[in-house]
Interface confidence: medium
Amino acid sequence: RRGAPAEDQDCGRLPDFIAKLTNNTHQHVFDDLSGSVSLSWVGDSTGVILVLTTFQVPLVIVSFGQSKLYRSEDYGKNFKDITNLINNTFIRTEFGMAIGPENSGKVILTAEVSGGSRGGRVFRSSDFAKNFVQTDLPFHPLTQMMYSPQNSDYLLALSTENGLWVSKNFGEKWEEIHKAVCLAKWGPNNIIFFTTHVNGSCKADLGALELWRTSDLGKTFKTIGVKIYSFGLGGRFLFASVMADKDTTRRIHVSTDQGDTWSMAQLPSVGQEQFYSILAANEDMVFMHVDEPGDTGFGTIFTSDDRGIVYSKSLDRHLYTTTGGETDFTNVTSLRGVYITSTLSEDNSIQSMITFDQGGRWEHLRKPENSKCDATAKNKNECSLHIHASYSISQKLNVPMAPLSEPNAVGIVIAHGSVGDAISVMVPDVYISDDGGYSWAKMLEGPHYYTILDSGGIIVAIEHSNRPINVIKFSTDEGQCWQSYVFTQEPIYFTGLASEPGARSMNISIWGFTESFITRQWVSYTVDFKDILERNCEEDDYTTWLAHSTDPGDYKDGCILGYKEQFLRLRKSSVCQNGRDYVVAKQPSVCPCSLEDFLCDFGYFRPENASECVEQPELKGHELEFCLYGKEEHLTTNGYRKIPGDKCQGGMNPAREVKDLKKKCTSNFLNPTKQNSKSNS
């Protein structure tokens, strides 16, 4: 479908691109000796970037540190030293720059303070870092300030003494609303959820914590759970892992009403050494990983129903190293329903799997056209693509970047990978898919950094090398043809590519440093591609594309989760600007229901490459129990339930029957006597 990528040869060269890019390349040399640089974008489409450089010298007793703060308001073309706005204070990099949600223009920097001080110090800005106000805190912060997603004036923070502090006026004044707090999170509607320890400490009381809620920023509280191990929020679901009465195992409970009522999730219980992890969640459903007993490095992915209660097995032997460890689970944001992850095969090698229907069925990634199977393959003609993600990066393989996709660059997925029977230790190449992961092509030889600009109109890449570099590569046809541009005569040690989040910008910043005998000097080059994409795209530059299309002759072609979507996509041959205001144009249409629109109900699973749901052998002939809103129920089922978010109508519709035996659940957690309200007086 697409040829092998070409670099500068057999490709339509863009006229005068070197002159156009040279005129739009802006260098900025940072006049300091810092060891590290962190960069944050402030707001959306504002062009404002904050750069914090830090230089630290560990001395015998204390460490001496210096920070510099720079600001750009033209997407990184020019920077101004604004260190004086923060009184030349040393900023604590472990807290990062706390940027407010949406376009609030709010920024908080946490300063280093001397040992004997009563509290910490922050610098606050609400005008996109034009001005900062110094504020001394009545506590020492343990975590970065957390903004309420609904109101950026509302902040919460945990102190080093485990106090929960809240501000209602963007950090000007603070109030401690609770002590002995282990974990706190914002929920919807400015609700705060937090766990507290009752006896000793967060660590000692793990499994005996209480889960509390306040809906009025700390005036009143409600205890919504006891015997808590931990909790999490995903989509519209609130999850808590709760210790069992009889042993040291724990189970997941789910609430969709902010903790007023709870249901026991139909997931296996886990022991002390195991863990649960919410891999992904949206308003419809959740992907949950349940760790296998023992130090296996894998577990099982389950997908939920629309209540987050009934789960079906989605993928076995899912790679997830340890609690808080590495998993390759990746949401392909450029196409609905697509996720990629890694499994651990019986011989402990690692293989990539992809699902196109939100976890209903997983398969190997199709072998890229014209590619050879590598030495991991038994059969040199049959193999698949394996994607390097977080685990490979954590293990220091030659993989500079995780897979990349953007919601507004429809269908595009870029990733490092190898072609064989399993992930290889050989130096990877970069592969691209333009149809959301159905088909792949080698995009670049060897490891690269890459980014998407102008909603997919331009892809930019830089070779990963331990030598200084001065060449940037770019493609205007989704990775088929590449042009090389020398952005500086003096090569730099490259440290990162930076482009505005959202992939709408046409600017890319190349960060790095030059090194002489004793000094390291940070430098950035910002390249603006606006003159490469000279004109705005017009109607004729777009073509219709049916997503998830695998069989054009079939009336159900493109149907995923009960509907199909036709997109208007930029033609590969069109060299024009999508522009910052580009909105993905799509035309949805509903499909008739079939087996594909139903996940396997609790106690059933779909064998590989099968459509029918089959009863799990270990449950055959057993009655199925599950807890729903505090009642124990027996479930009789024909094995199917509609996939959350599925919009199919008509066609096949297997029914499901639930008998309510109205027996109480045994979980203390659901005991209403435990749910009491308190006032903060």
């Epitope: 296996t296 019986e346 402990n348 690692i350 590598d374 685990y391 220091k396 399993a422 230790v425």
Partner: antibody
Framework: QVQLQESGPGLVKPSETLSLTCAVS?????????WGWIRQPPGKGLEWIGS???????YYNPSLKSRVTISVDTSKNQFSLKLSSVTAADTAVYYC????????????????????WGQGTMVTVSS | EIVMTQSPATLSVSPGERATLSCRAS??????LAWYQQKPGQAPRLLIY???TRATGIPARFSGSGSGTEFTLTISSLQSEDFAVYYC?????????FGGGTKVEIK
């Protein structure tokens, strides 16, 4: 096809440094894989000495770590072993080998399963 | 480090008969186990990896089984070229360790 060939002196004096080189043909070291050294004292079993990844990351057997250095020279397509302060106990056949191309999961992070071996070179430590 | 113990040290078998070699790990190595064959004056050759997967070009008469701490290499019908020393190796943890070997000799 891929071939490995060990080379180096067959006789080393006690307390000196044993130096061996493994030349790789039919495959570019810089394209990946792990490259390891294993030894076998006369009439005994196999002992893993250490491995190097093409990028230069090294992994050594703790029992030998203080004396071992493994390095890679991608321009010459070879990797080398240096074992310092040798004694008679270091007398063995020394093999170089290529680690499997598969990336295995495990707590050791980089794991070696040797799929191609050199024919070995006998090194005697004696004065 | 993980200690690999092979038994028996020597196994006497007639050509055409079945040979069963054992390898025990001092702690679980999951399925991260390989078997090698070594003939006199030659380098070892990879036979089995992942406890049960045959390496490229290895005849079907060689099979591996087991997981955790107990592993077996079976040669279903010994050919004259199969008389050699067999080593097991774990590759779960550094340092990588080999068993002491089992010599399969003609009865």
């Amino acid at each position: 096809q891929v071939q490995l060939q060990e080379s180096g002196p067959g006789l080393v004096k006690p307390s000196e440094t044993l130096s061996l080189t493994c030349a790789v043909s039919g495959y570019s070291i810089s394209s990946g894989y792990y490259w390891g050294w294993i030894r076998q004292p006369p009439g005994k079993g196999l002992e893993w000495i250490g491995s190097i990844y093409h990028s230069g990351s090294t992994y050594y057997n703790p029992s030998l770590k203080s004396r071992v250095t493994i390095s890679v020279d991608t321009s010459k397509n070879q990797f080398s072993l240096k074992l310092s302060s040798v004694t008679a106990a270091d007398t063995a056949v020394y093999y170089c080998a290529r680690g499997s191309p598969r990336f295995y999961y495990g707590s050791g992070s980089y794991l070696d399963l040797f799929d191609i071996w050199g024919q070995g070179t006998m090194v005697t430590v004696s004065s | 480090e993980i200690v690999m113990t092979q038994s028996p040290a020597t196994l006497s078998v007639s050509p055409g008969e079945r040979a069963t070699l054992s390898c025990r790990a001092s702690q679980s190595v999951s399925s991260n186990l390989a078997w090698y064959q070594q003939k006199p004056g030659q380098a070892p050759r990879l036979l089995i990896y992942g406890a049960s997967t045959r390496a490229t070009g290895i005849p079907a008469r060689f099979s591996g089984s087991g997981s955790g701490t107990e592993f077996t290499l079976t040669i279903s019908s010994l050919q004259s070229e199969d008389f050699a020393v067999y080593y097991c190796q774990e590759y779960l943890n550094y340092p990588i360790t080999f068993g002491g070997g089992t010599k399969v000799e003609i009865k």
